[in-house]
Interface confidence: medium
Amino acid sequence: RAPRCRELPAQKWWHTGALYRIGDLQAFQGHGAGNLAGLKGRLDYLSSLKVKGLVLGPIHKNQKDDVAQTDLLQIDPNFGSKEDFDSLLQSAKKKSIRVILDLTPNYRGENSWFSTQVDTVATKVKDALEFWLQAGVDGFQVRDIENLKDASSFLAEWQNITKGFSEDRLLIAGTNSSDLQQILSLLESNKDLLLTSSYLSDSGSTGEHTKSLVTQYLNATGNRWCSWSLSQARLLTSFLPAQLLRLYQLMLFTLPGTPVFSYGDEIGLDAAALPGQPMEAPVMLWDESSFPDIPGAVSANMTVKGQSEDPGSLLSLFRRLSDQRSKERSLLHGDFHAFSAGPGLFSYIRHWDQNERFLVVLNFGDVGLSAGLQASDLPASASLPAKADLLLSTQPGREEGSPLELERLKLEPHEGLLLRFPYAA
């Protein structure tokens, strides 16, 4: 008799793929644009990325550092009208893209939560949650919660409002903290909260360090759903050298949880390559004319247009990984087991019941390495085969689909491999 199938876990929409943050509408759309109507025209692009949710804004009225002149129910006219927003919601829904609204109150000011009148601000947030839930948004984000006094209790209250409206609504909190204890204390009192933090922001050094950060986090959070990013708002290039971007894309898409990206992460958008552009929100490079300040600064391979035409580009890798992440059971909700593969390497298996299984091997180092995969670290339910098929490599040159002998696996510097193998009873 065939073994019984494992019961599928309840999956919320944010479990099924990546979230895409557009914190600065104007930078995302480029010179002379930057409103909700224009964003509507970019939804097809978001669809092509196979992302499940768009984290938008803040877009509400906010007079810098002025509580009275901050209205979370009103859209800043520079971004458009309530009608424009409704129209964006409708269009997004048709394309199966959920919209999460950032309600960080004082986003133009020094302290995102103002320095005084905490209760007034918290009441404004409460009212805004109810208002925008009625308007049809799929969730909310609040950032910089380390600046919010009694953050845990406020988050619990806001979570109740959000979940009380529908279990299908999401609350994301963001913090600049990278301290695991602080992160855990925020998560403790908020069961379904999705938390973005700087926890992984200094992980770029070695495979061992990244492995220990990831495994510590997963062990500490138990079976609760995680999100994976390098910060609450900033681009990957703020933290990573260019040669590690592909590796991190592969890792973020294949860890158990929701990967969260900022606009531009899919093309390796880098403010440092665009003189004068703000680190937090450089202009999105749709094509070579997107940054006219210094025309020659942008080459085709830095842009969406150029990378869309190149199957070996970072954007093409992002699209492939996003596609895999959203359709493979083992990546959607599979178990995770990290195991030793040698110095400089981080490797793990994702598996779910009798579905196809995935092996990820990441070389964070500057030198080519032979992987000594220590299958003895793995439980019997996740044992390694002798060979696995190469689904993709972050580096060009390997023949995809070819079976690789796991005992003789050699990785190039900064190379990541995604391999697949079948369940064997």
Epitope: H31, A272, E288, P292, D293, I294, P295, A297
Partner: antibody, heavy 125, light 113 residues
Framework: QVQLVQSGAEVKKPGASVKVSCKAS????????MHWVRQAPGQGLEWMGI????????SYAQKFQGRVTMTRDTSTSTVYMELSSLRSEDTAVYYC??????????????????WGQGTMVTVSS | DIVMTQSPDSLAVSLGERATINCKSS????????????LAWYQQKPGQPPKLLIY???TSESGVPDRFSGSGSGTDFTLTISSLQAEDVAVYYC?????????FGQGTRLEIK
């Protein structure tokens, strides 16, 4: 009126570091970029890099990568340029220069409408 | 890097006469998307910082006397002083801002004959 006032002349030994300041007044500091340009005695002008006043992001000319650090303090409307591992060929007048802003497009083409008076840095053993 | 080459290195012109300084870039600084030439001209007098005269190859900075004009496109540019005045004695620099690093010409010294 709009002006940039730089710190005074410095004499340094090879291998040392120098930090030059540039205080802006008469305009909204955070709306403009600031650049550093140097000029060796009797020589031409050499662009060193840029700091975006609003966000502090920087971009340095390749030649100075690893040796130059540009920072800013918005509370005092001041930018700083620190050059380390000084050698005799770093002897020059160092200028801060405000990047132009096109008020119609809010783009920042990199030419310089306001300059500091210059700071002479002499590197000598 | 884009190399900017000025000619001549020095120039002596009589008061009231026309002075012409040339600047050549190693690659075009004309941007096809907006048809702008990313080139500026500066004047530097002894002991002073440079002063912006012309940008976009031909747009005069406000307050600059209208005897100063800029022309050219692509790789070849000219700064013209239609009627030289005594206060125009200085070194003149062209600068490209088409690409980083920003680069300047080596300078042209203008004197009175």
């Amino acid at each position: 009126q709009v002006q940039l006032v730089q710190s005074g002349a410095e004499v340094k030994k090879p291998g040392a570091s120098v930090k030059v300041s540039c205080k802006a007044s008469g305009y909204t500091f955070t709306s403009y970029q600031m650049h550093w340009v140097r000029q060796a005695p009797g020589q031409g002008l050499e662009w060193m890099g840029i700091i975006n006043d609003k966000h502090g992001s920087t971009s340095y000319a390749q030649k100075f990568q690893g040796r130059v650090t540009m920072t800013r303090d918005t509370s005092t409307s001041t930018v700083y340029m620190e050059l380390s591992s000084l050698r005799s060929e770093d002897t020059a007048v160092y200028y801060c220069a405000r990047g132009y802003e096109d008020s119609n497009t809010h783009q920042h083409p990199i030419f310089f409408d306001i300059w500091g008076q210059g700071t002479m840095v002499t590197v000598s053993s | 890097d884009i190399v900017m080459t000025q000619s001549p290195d020095s120039l002596a012109v009589s008061l009231g006469e026309r002075a012409t300084i040339n600047c050549k870039s190693s690659q075009s600084v004309l941007y096809r998307h907006n048809n702008n030439n990313y080139l500026a001209w500066y004047q530097q007098k002894p002991g002073q910082p440079p002063k912006l005269l012309i940008y976009w190859a031909s747009t005069s900075e406000s307050g600059v006397p209208d005897r100063f004009s800029g022309s050219g496109s692509g790789t070849d540019f000219t700064l013209t002083i239609s009627s030289l005045q005594a206060e125009d004695v200085a070194v003149y620099y062209c600068q490209q801002y088409y690409n980083t690093p920003i680069t300047f010409g080596q300078g042209t010294r203008l004197e009175i004959k």
